[in-house]
């Protein structure tokens, strides 16, 4: 049975050019995270492997940095950045646990953060 | 190479508190659930906690709930546990153990003793 | 809970010649991701217990292949193509497939 439940930064946004933290947590549960991955709807971001460290895509990395934690900061943002963001965890012997944020890359200074909630 | 040690035990009275540590090296403690599994004299293993990477989720079995608190500090590398309102049956040699590779105790410590006597 | 029973409680071996552990269940330890999370461990007089096989038949790393586990559903088995005298210990099956994770009795293989 997978009683775990992950917790994220929700919906959040940031203004053009700057950077945002995206963080989930996993809890409720003692299972082994053997690894964690983000997605930008079908792409891989980066991977954090617990014996590996931390993997990010080439195409990417000249903008995402790893952490804090196991969370993934995104740097130089662009409008197109806007749209769902999913980490996902890999656990034995619970199996996969998904977390969704939605981030809006906006134009102006009117950025604000979303409440934090939780996806069972 | 993965290695844990195990200090802490000793002879205690009835009622009475002790508290178990576990020092890792060898890997990212960090990243790894560990346990407790006991193993009283002549008799065979049994899980005793379990706490997740973080800290922040624990597992215990009824014999134990509500007297045991496992927690770690992983700037240390250390796993503890803490025992209260020890009994008679509470007299073991204690592992602790750390998964890997599927495995939920793919690695042991060399095990403390502990004595709940009067 | 899941019961775990091992038999046979004792088991005296000739090196050389195999030898077989039973493990069951009392109810199935198949896990809803559809792993079945069957270990077996072996501890050796005045050691730790080792890891010898996991997820019912996969050798940890180092494990002699004479080690053998094979099963499914709630009846597991450990076998030994050929025992050696390095072989004799207690052996535990163990689940985590549900809370509480549980072991087996144990059973003690030791040289006739």
């Known amino acids: 049975m997978m009683t775990g439940t992950i917790e994220t930064t929700g919906n959040i946004s940031a203004e053009k050019g700057g950077s945002i933290i995206l963080q989930c947590h996993l809890s409720s549960t003692t299972a082994q995270v053997t690894q964690v991955n983000w997605e930008q709807q079908d792409q891989l971001l980066a991977i954090c492997n617990a014996d590996l460290g931390w993997h990010i895509s080439p195409s990417f990395k000249d903008r995402v940095a790893p952490g804090p934690g196991l969370g993934l900061t995104l740097q130089s943002l662009t409008v197109n950045d806007t749209g769902e963001y999913f980490c996902i965890y890999h656990t034995y012997p619970d199996g996969t646990y998904t977390g969704r944020i939605f981030l809006e890359v906006l134009e102006s200074s009117v950025a604000e953060h979303g409440a934090r909630f939780q996806i069972p | 190479e993965v290695q844990l040690v195990e200090s802490g035990g000793g002879l205690v009275q009835p009622g009475g508190s002790l508290r178990l540590s576990c020092a890792a090296s060898?890997?990212?403690?960090?990243?790894?659930?560990m346990s407790w599994v006991r193993q009283a004299p002549g008799k065979g293993l049994e899980l005793v906690a379990e706490i997740s990477s973080s800290g922040g989720s624990t597992y215990y079995p009824d014999t134990v709930k509500g007297r045991f608190t496992i927690s770690r500090d992983n700037s240390k590398n250390t796993l503890y546990l803490q025992m209260n309102s020890l009994r008679a049956e509470d007299t073991a040699v204690y592992y602790c153990a750390r998964p890997g590779l599927g495995a939920w105790f793919a690695y042991w410590g060399q095990g403390t003793l502990v004595t709940v006597s009067s | 809970d899941v019961v775990m029973t091992q038999s046979p409680l004792s088991l005296p071996v000739t090196p050389g010649e195999p030898a077989s552990i039973s493990c069951r269940s009392s109810q199935s330890i198949v896990h809803n991701s559809g792993n079945t999370y069957l270990e077996w461990y072996l501890q050796k007089p005045g050691q730790s217990p080792k890891l010898l096989i996991y997820?019912?038949?996969n050798r940890f790393s180092g494990v002699p292949d004479r080690f053998s586990g094979s099963g499914s559903g709630t009846d597991f088995t450990l076998k030994i193509s050929r025992v050696e005298a390095e072989d004799v210990g207690v052996y535990y099956c163990?689940?985590?497939?549900?809370?509480?994770?549980?072991f087996g009795g144990g059973t003690k293989v030791e040289i006739k």
């Open positions: 997820k019912v038949s």
């Open positions: 163990f689940q985590f497939s549900h809370v509480p994770r549980t």
């Open positions: 060898g890997f990212t403690f960090s990243s790894y659930t």
